[in-house]
Interface confidence: low
């Protein structure tokens, strides 16, 4: 699997969405996990409903948002109010018992404000940061990583 | 023998500012993910920031994220714990621990070092 | 984030005596899950990792198991030198949580 590769301005809110094949993963819950060095297990961050009927509801970890449409074959993972140290390597993962199948690996990368490389004359509208789904960044690119993913827990 | 050794703490008004300094010796610095965690008087712990052996990724706690910041130089051996906006609830312990071969298990431990924040 | 319930919170116990302290957490954690020894003064030690698995110089009575949501530390006969608090903490998830430790204490 290439790792995708998303930026996101610190502050703001960042959206992952993860595909993957709806009748294959039928049944099964999805999970985003974070990767702490370059071994050892995938630390869930969060994970969908417990009854999978009711995946598409959003569960929530301090600042990290999931939600499943089991139909469309798309798991979303959002990371609110994003800071530099949520810049790391992630995955998306289909949970089937105590296995776990990777669907994506991502790399979040944390970008400063820009108003902190302009001149103080300057005036900036901040963005509207109320409402669940504003100020998203979905800048994404794909690029092969060197890292490696063990199992996880 | 693996040996850690917190420095830094110290008495602090709310809002004001501390860096605590862990120096590390007996293994290969570089190899290993480092911790902070904190014990606040009385209480249990808590993990606060984590930092891969390279220094490039970097993992806080909901209750420090945007005021603490970790960092390491592998040259000089050293763990850093930049506390800013310091409020009453982050007068602990702090202690630097080894994180052994990525896991987030704390194989070694220094001794500690408080942390008052008080006016 | 996870949350780590210990019980007993106190267990008064004589030396020779066995310690069994319980973990629970609020979901699976799998099998990672440590425990630790702390006594007054002084940083935590690490005894189990992995639930089970006896960190480096950790004597033989003291022994981790279970797995996912219930865990146990059992102390085969206490020591003198074992009187203190025990956490346990999980890295399944993250952040990383402590128990709220249970105090073992001379009866």
């Known amino acids: 699997l290439n790792t995708t590769v998303l930026q996101g301005m610190a502050g703001q809110s960042l959206r992952v969405s993860c595909t993957y094949d709806a009748l294959k993963h039928w049944g099964r819950r999805k999970a985003w996990c974070r990767q702490l060095g370059e071994e050892g297990p995938c630390q869930r961050v969060v994970s969908t409903h417990g009854v999978w009927l009711l995946a598409f509801l959003k569960k929530r970890n301090g600042s990290t948002v999931i939600a499943d449409d089991t139909l469309a074959g798309t798991v979303t993972i959002t990371l609110k109010n994003l800071q530099a140290g949520d810049a790391g390597l992630y995955q998306c993962q289909s949970l089937r018992g105590r296995e776990a199948e990777v669907l994506q690996k991502v790399l979040v990368e944390v970008l400063e404000d820009p108003l902190d490389d302009q001149d103080a004359g300057d005036l900036w509208v901040p963005e509207e940061s109320s409402s669940f789904e504003g100020a998203q960044v979905e800048h994404s690119t794909s690029r092969n990583q060197e890292t490696s993913f063990p199992p996880t827990s | 023998e693996v040996q850690l050794l917190e420095s830094g703490g110290g008495l602090v008004q709310p809002g004001g500012s501390l860096r605590l300094s862990c120096a590390a010796s007996g293994f290969t610095f570089s190899s290993y993910a480092m911790s902070w965690v904190r014990q606040a008087p009385g209480k249990g712990l808590e993990w606060v920031s984590a930092?891969?052996?390279?220094?490039?990724?970097?993992y806080y706690a909901d209750s420090v994220k945007g005021r603490f910041t970790i960092s390491r130089d592998n040259s000089k051996n050293t763990l850093y714990l930049q506390m800013n906006s310091l409020r009453a609830e982050d007068t602990a312990v702090y202690y630097c621990?080894?994180?052994?071969?990525?896991?987030?298990?704390?194989?070694?431990w220094g001794q500690g070092t408080l942390v008052t924040v008080s006016s | 984030e996870i949350v780590l319930t210990q019980s007993p919170a106190t267990l008064s116990l004589s030396p020779g005596e066995r310690a069994t302290l319980s973990c629970r957490a609020s979901?699976?954690?799998?099998?990672?899950l440590a425990w630790y020894q702390q006594k007054p003064g002084q940083a935590p030690r690490l005894l189990i990792y992995?639930?089970?698995n006896r960190a480096t110089g950790i004597p033989a009575r003291f022994s981790g198991s279970g797995s996912g949501t219930d865990f146990t530390l059992t102390i085969s006969s206490l020591e003198p030198e074992d009187f203190a608090v025990y956490y346990c903490?999980?890295?399944?998830?993250?952040?990383?949580?402590f128990g709220g430790g249970t105090k073992v204490e001379i009866k």
């Open positions: 992995d639930a089970s």
């Open positions: 979901q699976s954690v799998s099998s990672y």
């Open positions: 621990a080894r994180v052994p071969k990525h896991y987030v298990v704390l194989d070694y």
């Open positions: 903490q999980q890295y399944s998830f993250f952040p990383p949580t």
């Open positions: 930092i891969s052996g390279s220094g490039g990724s970097t």
